[in-house]
Structures are given as structure tokens and as C-alpha cells.
């Protein structure tokens, strides 16, 4: 029968009995955290053939092979993955081999087999027969192959029973254990599966079948299963479910989420029975099982019980994630925070409508309000005392409200109030009056011209660039020398630059008053010669990358009619030149006949330009005589089994270092020091390992139910 919706077996090995009648697990299978070594020989689940999501094994003491538990597991579909993986075997202290000798197909996702101190028979499995792409597989920190002495069936008796394939230029026998070969179908079957007797299955079968060319005899289906038959698509009036079977409307209508209300059943959309309408669609009415497209972002109405939602941290902003209409009032009070502008944009950036008022006070961390990037309407249904629906008070670093060239905001009812915002120019406030339609509503004291913008360069002159020169990783720019009325007031210039794939950046993007800034900054001193134009060489840039650049003059706070004069340029977009691409990734070669090689690769991670073609070079290599030097089948040649510690293997040198000519003298050579790129790759690898381990722990360690 079908079991689901994911089975988690932990702490007690007897819970395995839950798998007794399962033929398909509709969901994942976790077997983990069984710390007492048990005898698993009496547990066998021959009925289980398919897992639709992923299989995760973690810290199960005493389990030595999976072959006895799941002798007929044939397909792991990977419909949902565990951190990009469909098979995860992690820290299995006693596992000696995987042994899933009937596993023929992992439809989606990669495998991660890591930190299994006693695990062998990894190099004898050809994963390319099971997965479409092996480049993302991660097999690290297991028992070193040379300590395993993996022998496929019949090798010792010189009557090898298994077939050979080539992996990494090594042509060898393929097996799961000392007595189980890896099954391969005849080449005549092409991509099709085959029976135990090597007869080709029906094209709709996946993994295996009990009779040839019969779509009712499949062990698993390539596409969908319906009423005992494997079908390429679900028949009329049936719907895809969980990526593998077809169900009728009645079935879909009867699916529940444990916490759902009556109006929140599953929906039918695009031929699929699913939990929610996909992104960009909304239910066609509260009781409906069908979805219709949203106009613009899908509406999500959020309401605050206490009418006013105070945003004083990222955590409080998080509650508004995805909201497009906020019923109530927003009080923004952000005094400090890390990377606050982009965090707020992430959680509040979809809000389009606020039904009440918006009040921003004591938010010293804010430089701009652009994090409310979709706000288009403040209804002002509820107003502050004095009839204010937009109130901005004492924000010491606020410099920009919004980019009014690209912003349409309407305040339907109520007035605006601005006071004690020393870096906010009054011209910016006046511009907001015009755009929002509030001009004429404010009385004289509502916009204070003395304490708004008192410490800002409000009357800006424009700096003009005079020249730009680019190379693959450098940009040289010069600009007109700015001449304020008193030249002594000009101190220096600051150049701001950052990568900008699109020409849509603003000065305040990602910037807050707590030091977070998405722009790189470089100070440029004034050239001593008054006639030389100031300029800068920006280096260490990426090839074939568009950068945004602007320049600001740093001036003394020279007061002129209560305001400071300053100067800055427009934002300039410049692309660096193309360069040589990095090397193509994951190069694999295999022979499919005596006169052909098939070579596959992935594009380079850094194309550094538009790739137009690849060059493939090859040359004939002499046969490696070293392979014939030893009889690997004689017992004494199998290395002594040392117990691996499950840490990441570093290949130790067993022979004496080779003596070669080094530096003009004979003598033992030291290993070459690692290049910066190698060090960086190692660092990234270690980081990736940590991220995965954290993800694993966070996913599986859950509080005990009350």
C-alpha cells in the first residue's frame, strides 16, 4: 500500500515495523538517531519499491547494510529533496556497504554520502547508471578505498560475475557488495529499464518490471501511475498528485492539512492536485478548488489585532513577509540593526496599501524609505492627533524618502508632518507633497524648514564625468573639478561603485546608517595642480561585468541661506572588457564503442564574456603499465583494514618522496604551496560542509511533543 506523507523513524528501531506493508512511500523516509546498536537482521521490507521524495539515514548504530532492509527499493524519485539530495547517508558509524542492489533510478537530485567511517563499496558503484548527472554527488569522509579492498562477486575465483563500466578513466567491475552485482540493462534497451532476464520493459516503466513491454508490469512508472497502469499523462478528469500518481477530484477534495480550516483544502491547477495555488495565482473564491491568475502580485491582507504594528526590529518586520495590504497603522522605530535596509525590504517590500497612517520616528538606522518599495497608497482611514496620516519625526540619518522619478504614492486622506530630520532636504519633502497629492493640506508648522535638512548638502551641483577607460578588470574615470564659491570648502571626493547587472540602482540601495552599504567607497584626494581633473583607477574588478559608479564632493558645512552646498554626479553604468573564461567544469569522458569517446562538460563558472565556442583537444596516451604490476586478487595484496575516523580524507603519502631536480639541485621535493584559488576552494568546501551539517541538524532535531 501507499504510505505517507513522509515517515520518520527515530530513537526506537522497532518503529521500522511501520514500513511493513508499504510498497510506495509517498514522501520521504528518515531513519535516524538510533543510538543503541541493534540486530536488524529480522527486519526486512521487500514490498518497498519506491520512495517519492528522498531517503535520509543519520546516526543509526548497528546497521551494516541497507540491502537486507530494502532488498527491492528500485526508485527514489526526488520529487522533494533534502538540501538538493535524494539520498543522504551521514555519520552512519557501522554501515559497511550501501547494498541497495535493486536501486536503478534516482529521478531527481544528487547523493550525499559523508562521514561514514566504515563504509566501503563506494567506488564500485557506477552512479551514472542511476542518476542523470553525477557532478553534484558528494561522497567524502568515508573509509578510504585502499583500506576497503572492495571485491566484486567472483573476482577472487577469477570468474568475475559483474559487468564493467568506466568511471574517471577506470574501467572496472560494478557491484554493491561482495555478492551483489550492479544491474545493467542491455544497450538495445537504450534508456528503458529491463527485467531480471534482461528483456526490455515498456517505455513507461522506470527501474524494472516483472514482464517485458507491458505497462501494467512496471515496478515504478517513468511518468504517472493510474489504476495499475503506467501512463505518460494523467487521463481526463484525473490530476497529478505528489509527482507520481493520478487521482480524481473526489480524492483531491478530501485532502486536508492538519491545521487547515474548511476553506483551505487542496486545489486543482494546471492538471495537478496541490496544497496551494502556485506563485502568481489565487483561489477563485474562498471555497473554491481552482486558481485564477493574480493581477500583479497576489494580494495578501495582513491585519494587526492592536490596530498599530510597531516595526522596531527585523523580527517584527518578518511578520509582514508577503503582505500586500496592511489593515492598520505602521509605526516604524528602527534605532539600530545589521543590514537593516535589505532585511526590511525583504519583509516589507511587497506592501502596496496601508489603510491607516504611517509614522516613522527615532529611526536613526534608516537612510531611506525605499525598503517600502511597492507602497502606492496610504488610505489614512485612521489618523494621528492633528489629522496626520504620514508622520516623520527625529530620524537623524534619513536622507531620502523615495526615488520620486520612479514612485507613485497617493495619500488619500490626512496631512503630512516632518520635523527634526537633519539630513532630509526640504526639497525632498516638497517633492513628496506634489507626488502624493497632499500639497495644500499641510499648515505652516507641519513641514519645518529649519530643522529638516539642516545638516545636509541640499543644494547640490552636478559633477560631470569627462572620461572613462576600461580593461578586463579595471575602470579609469575622471570628472570635472568642482569649484564651490570658496575653493577651501572642497575637501576631497568619494567614489561609490558596485556591480549592477541592471540599470536600475539608486544611491540609497542597501544602505543604512549602521554601516551596511551595498556600495564600495574610495576616497580621492584633490589633485595638487588646480588644472588637473580628478580621477581614479578602480581595480580588482570582474571581467565583462556592468558596474554603477557615482562621485560625491566632500565639502565643509558651508552655510548659505541655512543650507549647505554640495555636488554629486549622476549614476554612470560601465561594463568592463571581456576576458578569458575560467575552465569548463565537470569534464567527463566515456567510451561507447572501440572508436568513439563521448565527452561531456558544464559551462565555466566564470564565462567572463559571451561564450561563442569550445575547443576540445585530445591525444593518444600509452597504456599504464603500473596497472599490471600487482595481482590485486591475491590475499596479501589487500591492504590491512584500518578503522577510519569519519573525518575528511587526506591522502597520506606511503612511499618516500620522489627525488627530483629541484631548484637546480638533486633532493627531495616539497609539495608546492597551495595557490590562492586552491586555498579559496578549500575554504568554500569547508564552509559548504558546515552549511549542510547545520541544515541537517536544524531539520531533524525537533522538540519532543508535549
Amino acid at each position: 500500500e501507499i504510505c505517507g506523507p513522509g515517515i520518520d523513524i527515530r530513537n526506537d528501531y522497532q518503529q521500522l515495523k511501520r514500513l511493513e506493508n508499504c510498497t510506495v512511500i509517498e514522501g520521504y523516509l528518515h531513519i535516524l538517531l538510533i543510538s543503541k546498536a541493534e540486530d536488524y537482521r529480522s527486519y526486512r521490507f521487500p514490498k518497498l519499491t519506491v520512495i517519492t521524495e528522498y531517503l535520509l539515514l543519520f546516526r543509526v548504530a548497528g546497521l551494516e547494510s541497507l540491502g537486507d532492509l530494502f532488498p527491492n527499493l528500485t526508485v527514489i524519485r526526488g520529487w522533494k529533496l533534502f538540501y538538493n539530495y535524494a539520498l543522504v547517508i551521514f555519520e552512519m558509524t557501522n554501515l559497511k556497504d550501501i547494498g541497495l542492489y535493486n536501486l536503478r533510478n534516482i529521478t531527481r537530485g544528487a547523493i550525499r554520502i559523508e562521514k561514514n567511517a566504515d563504509l566501503c563499496y563506494l567506488s564500485t558503484v557506477d552512479w551514472s547508471l542511476i542518476l542523470d548527472a553525477v557532478s553534484n554527488n558528494y561522497i567524502v569522509g568515508n573509509k578510504p578505498p585502499k583500506e576497503c579492498g572492495d571485491l566484486c562477486p567472483g573476482t577472487m575465483e577469477e570468474k568475475p560475475m559483474c559487468e564493467k563500466t568506466t568511471i574517471n578513466n577506470e574501467y572496472n567491475y560494478r557491484c554493491w557488495t561482495t555478492n551483489r552485482c550492479q544491474k545493467m540493462c542491455p544497450s538495445t534497451c537504450g534508456k528503458r529499464a529491463c527485467t531480471e532476464n534482461n528483456e526490455c520493459c515498456h517505455p513507461e516503466c522506470l527501474g524494472s518490471c516483472s514482464a517485458p513491454d507491458n505497462d501494467t508490469a512496471c515496478v515504478a512508472c517513468r511518468h504517472y501511475y493510474y489504476a495499475g497502469v503506467c501512463v505518460p499523462a494523467c487521463p481526463p478528469n484525473t490530476y497529478r498528485f505528489e509527482g507520481w500518481r493520478c487521482v480524481d477530484r473526489d480524492f483531491c477534495a478530501n485532502i486536508l492539512s492538519a491545521e487547515s480550516s474548511d476553506s483551505e483544502g487542496f486545489v486543482i491547477h494546471d492538471g495537478e492536485c496541490m496544497q496551494e495555488c502556485p506563485s502568481g495565482f489565487i483561489r477563485n473564491g474562498s471555497q473554491s478548488m481552482y486558481c485564477i491568475p493574480c493581477e500583479g502580485p497576489c494580494p495578501k491582507v495582513c491585519e494587526e489585532e492592536k490596530k498599530t504594528k510597531t516595526i522596531d526590529s527585523v523580527t517584527s518586520a518578518q511578520m509582514l513577509q508577503g503582505c500586500t495590504i496592511f489593515k492598520g497603522n505602521l509605526l516604524i522605530n528602527i534605532r539600530r540593526g545589521n543590514n537593516i535596509a535589505s532585511e526590511l525590504e525583504n519583509f516589507m517590500g511587497l506592501i502596496e496599501v496601508v489603510t491607516g497612517y504611517v509614522k516613522i520616528r527615532h529611526s536613526h538606522a534608516l537612510v531611506s524609505l525605499s525598503f517600502l518599495k511597492n507602497l502606492r497608497l496610504i488610505l489614512g482611514e485612521e489618523q494621528l492627533e492633528g489629522n496626520y496620516s504620514f508622520y516623520v519625526l527625529d530620524n537623524q540619518n534619513l536622507q531620502q524618502l523615495w526615488d520620486w522619478d520612479h514612485r507613485n504614492l497617493t495619500i488619500k486622506a490626512g496631512k503630512m508632518y516632518f520635523a527634526f530630520n537633519p539630513k532630509l532636504c526640504v526639497s525632498e519633502i516638497y517633492r513628496m507633497e506634489e507626488v502624493t497629492g497632499t500639497k495644500g493640506r499641510q499648515s505652516k508648522g507641519d513641514i519645518n524648514t529649519r530643522n529638516n535638512g539642516e545638516r545636509a548638502s541640499c543644494e547640490s551641483d552636478v559633477l560631470h564625468f569627462t572620461s572613462t577607460t576600461t580593461s578586463k578588470n579595471r575602470i579609469i574615470i575622471t570628472w570635472h573639478r568642482y569649484r564651490p564659491p570658496d575653493y577651501r570648502d572642497l575637501i576631497s571626493f568619494t567614489v561609490y561603485y558596485k556591480e549592477a547587472p541592471f540599470k536600475n540602482v539608486t544611491e540609497y540601495d542597501g544602505q543604512d546608517a549602521c554601516g551596511s552599504n551595498s556600495w564600495n567607497m574610495v576616497d580621492v584626494d584633490l589633485p595638487p595642480n588646480k588644472d588637473v581633473e580628478p580621477g581614479i583607477l578602480l581595480h580588482g574588478l570582474k571581467p565583462w561585468t556592468q558596474y554603477a559608479v557615482y562621485v560625491k564632493a566632500v565639502t565643509l558645512t558651508m552655510v548659505e541661506n541655512d543650507h549647505i552646498r554640495g555636488a554629486k554626479s549622476e549614476i554612470l553604468y560601465i561594463r568592463t572588457n571581456a576576458s578569458v573564461p575560467s575552465i569548463p567544469l565537470d569534464v567527463l569522458s566515456a567510451s561507447n564503442s572501440s572508436s568513439q569517446l563521448i565527452v561531456k562538460w558544464n559551462p565555466p563558472s566564470l564565462p567572463n564574456g559571451n561564450l561563442s565556442y569550445y575547443i576540445v583537444r585530445w591525444q593518444r596516451q600509452p597504456q599504464d603499465g603500473y596497472l599490471y604490476r600487482h595481482n590485486y586478487c591475491s590475499k596479501d595484496k589487500i591492504p590491512i583494514r584500518k578503522y577510519a575516523d569519519g573525518t575528511i580524507d587526506i591522502e597520506e603519502v606511503t612511499e618516500n618522496p620522489k627525488t627530483e631536480v629541484c631548484g637546480g639541485e638533486k633532493g627531495p621535493c616539497c609539495a608546492c604551496p597551495k595557490t590562492e584559488a586552491e586555498k579559496q576552494a578549500e575554504k568554500e568546501e569547508a564552509e559548504y560542509r558546515k552549511v549542510f551539517e547545520n541544515f541537517l541538524h536544524n531539520s531533524i532535531f525537533v522538540p519532543r511533543p508535549e
Partner: nanobody, 124 residues
Framework: QVKLEESGGGLVQAGGSLRLSCVAS????????MAWFRQAPGKEREFVAT????????RYADSVKGRFFISKDSAKNTIYLEMNSLEPEDTAVYYC?????????????????WGQGTQVTVSS
């Protein structure tokens, strides 16, 4: 473990009514929903109705909609199946089932815990 015990089955005339009860005991906190399934002689076990434990949301098979009603009494850890307008085709062994799943489908393999069943016979 969750233990389930059904009662209330019996013989009834077509058009009559019956009320089945199912009491849950043991680790009842690990249950998110409960359901009734039935199995007629020589047939597969089929879904009848389900109810979620927290919100009390219900779902019914098309064949029983409007005639059968599932309900719960949280204080007594009990669910009920009120069966009206019974037909001879409703004759079966009725099983109570419980699940700890976050998503519950009418598939019987989604239910971890089962009762022994109670016989309902509808005579014409």
C-alpha cells in the same frame, strides 16, 4: 502508541440510522486527525470521512456526503460517525484510524493507528 476502540455497530434496516464511536487512548498528543474507513467483503478498505483534531475540519467520500456526519469530543478523546439513510451498500466492517501526519489524504497508508473494526449490516 495510540490505541483505538470502536463501538456502536450492529444490524439495521435500510433507511435507518446508527452512531459509531471510537475512543482513543495512549499517546493521543501525537495525532493530528482521525478517520473512518470501511471494508465490505471481498473489497478494498475505503475512506469514509476524516476530521482534524485541532480545527475540526471535516471531509467525506462522495458516496456518503449528506448522509454521514463525523464529529469529535476532545474532552472524551472520542470521534463519532452519525450514519443516516443507510443503504445495503453501506454494509461493511467500519474501522477507526488515526494519523500524526501534517497532510492527510484519503489513502489508508497515511494512517498509522487502527482499531479492530465494528461490523455494520444494513438489511433490505
Amino acid at each position: 502508541q495510540v490505541k483505538l476502540e470502536e463501538s456502536g455497530g450492529g444490524l439495521v434496516q435500510a433507511g435507518g440510522s446508527l452512531r459509531l464511536s471510537c475512543v482513543a487512548s495512549g499517546r493521543t498528543f501525537s495525532r493530528t486527525a482521525m478517520a473512518w474507513f470501511r471494508q465490505a467483503p471481498g473489497k478494498e478498505r475505503e475512506f469514509v470521512a476524516t476530521i482534524t483534531w485541532n480545527s475540526g475540519t471535516t471531509r467525506y467520500a462522495d458516496s456518503v456526503k449528506g448522509r454521514f456526519f463525523i464529529s469529535k469530543d476532545s474532552a472524551k478523546n472520542t470521534i463519532y460517525l452519525e450514519m443516516n439513510s443507510l443503504e445495503p451498500e453501506d454494509t461493511a466492517v467500519y474501522y477507526c484510524a488515526a494519523t500524526a501526519a501534517a497532510v492527510i489524504t484519503p489513502t489508508r497508508g497515511y494512517y498509522n493507528y487502527w482499531g479492530q473494526g465494528t461490523q455494520v449490516t444494513v438489511s433490505s
